[in-house]
């Protein structure tokens, strides 16, 4: 079939002397080239057999091939074990001897190798990982594997890879492959969708208090996907937290401490494979002035006759921006002393001898007065007077 | 708002190593991508390298793997492209750019243009 004909003429003097043309026609044979030669570039697919564990491999030639001792089924050879090399002598009628000797260096089996999603569950709002595990061992030199991902547009050779600062709630596509001695073996492809986000801030609109014991907080929820809110309202160290239904934009806050700074953070929250707060977004309010309670551990003890000193302690609950004692002094219905002073402690001098007199002590705090603490103590009789009369008789 | 500010450019001869920083201020850095462009004269700003906020993650233009490095200190809040066995077509303006989903806009195929913040640039230039 690759034979050609080459036409060749000739022409020669018949003995009349009138020219005679005669024409041969000669058959030749061009050299062909060695089957060697040939199939020098030859290139292998190799496809696996998960039943039998058994690989073929796919010679990719345009005609039939033969193959020696090894027989071949329209170009494949069957029955191939992993890690081990196998010859194939590769003829055909277009070419000539030597045949070419193929080595057939098979690869490892295809279920030795598990593509693995290692994205740490922390991460998986922004970040996927993937990763080729050797769950089999085997015989075949893992110098000759190499991996490959394509991600979209971006094409990694590495057998595991890492992508960060993703789109949250995402789909990605990755596709690998692995090759032995540049010869693929076995693909595998991931769609991997990114883990919902940590939602945005919520924005407060308003944060206030216009009471002593209440406070209020408006917000706009944030754009993206949450669950609930988390409302936490601090003063001084002490911090109590609530946990808000994501439908709420206001909430009232009740029992609150009077003439006291509340510190308020709100944060939306989502429960993905891990459970991811949104920044906080923060506000504060001072709630209002409210009647101090009481001082306590009053005293009055007597200085001289008719003199008394009278202390206390300070209210637990001042509830005021200023501190101020006062002390107010009766006898009977008549208010005799009324003073104030930066501590709860009163020199109340030049009362009447032997008198009963009511002590009512109570803290102001510029605001409110407290409810006084009431007791009730008696002058002594001049002593001094007694004891000049006794002398003079 | 992202600042940032490229250096370590400088003429050097095919074959040498430059290593290019870039030092950003403003904002969260380990949050951010960071990436290395290029543009040469008369051609269009291209893709050389990007690494992931935590630095566990990095991605190299073809014509770059295996000669240019990316890192990233996110203590110093800076980046660097390490280049070695550079070549005359290596010479160009490199821009250092930050952005929070620049892996997502890699994996589109997003043009330069759409990403977030960019240097002034650094010329480097590979001539004997």
């Known amino acids: 079939s690759d034979a050609y004909l080459n036409a060749s003429e000739t022409t020669t003097l018949s003995p009349s002397g009138s020219a005679v043309i005669s024409t041969t026609t000669i058959a030749t044979t061009p050299s062909k080239p060695t089957c060697d030669e040939k199939y020098a570039n030859i290139t292998v697919d190799y496809l696996y057999n998960k039943e039998t564990k058994l690989f073929t491999a796919k010679l990719n030639v345009n005609e039939n091939v033969e193959c020696g001792n090894n027989t071949c089924t329209n170009n494949e050879v069957h029955n191939l074990t992993e890690c081990k090399n196998a010859s194939v002598s590769i003829s055909h009628n277009s070419c000539t001897a030597p045949d070419k000797t193929l080595i057939l260096d098979v690869p490892p089996g295809v279920e030795k190798f598990q593509l693995h999603d290692c994205t740490q569950v922390e991460k998986a709002d922004t970040t996927i990982c993937l990763k080729w595990k050797n769950i089999e061992t085997f015989t075949c030199d893992t110098q000759n594997i190499t991996y490959r991902f394509q991600c979209g547009n971006m094409i990694f050779d590495n057998k595991e890879i890492k992508l960060e600062n993703l789109e949250p709630e995402h789909e990605y596509k990755c596709d690998s492959e692995i090759l032995y001695n540049n010869h693929k073996f076995t693909n595998a492809s991931k769609i991997i969708k990114t883990d919902f986000g940590s939602p945005g801030e919520p924005q407060i609109i308003f944060c206030r208090s216009e009471a002593a014991h209440q406070g209020v907080i408006t917000w706009n929820p944030p754009q993206r996907s949450f669950h609930n809110f988390t409302l936490c309202y601090i003063k001084e160290t002490e911090k109590d937290c609530l946990n808000l239904d994501k439908n709420l934009i206001k909430y009232d806050l009740q029992n609150l401490k009077p003439y006291t700074k509340y510190v308020l953070s709100l944060h939306a929250y989502i429960i993905a494979k891990v459970q991811r707060n949104g920044s906080a977004a923060m506000c504060h309010f001072t709630t209002k002035s409210a009647p101090p309670s009481q001082v306590w551990n009053m005293t009055v003890s007597m200085t001289s006759d008719n003199s008394m000193h009278v202390k206390c302690r300070p209210p637990r609950d001042r509830n005021g921006p200023h501190e101020r004692y006062h002390l107010e002094v009766e006898a009977g219905n008549t208010l005799v002393r009324n003073e104030s002073h930066k501590n709860c402690d009163f020199r109340v001098k030049d009362l009447q001898y032997s008198t009963d007199y009511t002590f009512k002590a109570y803290f102001h705090n510029g605001d409110y007065p407290g409810e006084p603490f009431i007791l009730h103590h008696s002058t002594s009789y001049n002593s001094k007077a007694h004891h000049h009369h006794h002398h003079h008789h | 708002q992202v600042q940032l500010q490229e250096s370590g450019g400088g003429l050097v001869r095919p074959g040498g190593s430059l290593r290019l920083s870039c030092a950003a201020s403003?904002?969260?850095?380990?949050?951010?991508?960071m990436g290395w462009f290029r543009q040469a004269p008369g051609k269009e700003r291209e893709f050389v390298a990007a690494?992931?906020?935590?630095?566990?993650?990095?991605y190299y233009a073809d014509s770059v793997k295996g000669r240019f490095t990316i890192s990233r200190d996110n203590a110093k809040n800076t980046a660097y492209l390490q280049m070695n066995s550079l070549k005359p077509e290596d010479t160009a303006v490199y821009y250092c750019?930050?952005?929070?989903?620049?892996?997502?806009?890699?994996?589109?195929?997003?043009?330069?243009?759409?990403?977030?913040?960019w240097g002034q640039g650094t010329l480097v230039t590979v001539s004997s």
């Open positions: 750019q930050a952005d929070p989903t620049m892996f997502h806009k890699l994996y589109y195929g997003i043009h330069p243009n759409e990403y977030e913040y």
């Open positions: 690494i992931g906020g935590s630095g566990d993650s990095t």
């Open positions: 403003g904002g969260t850095f380990s949050s951010y991508a």
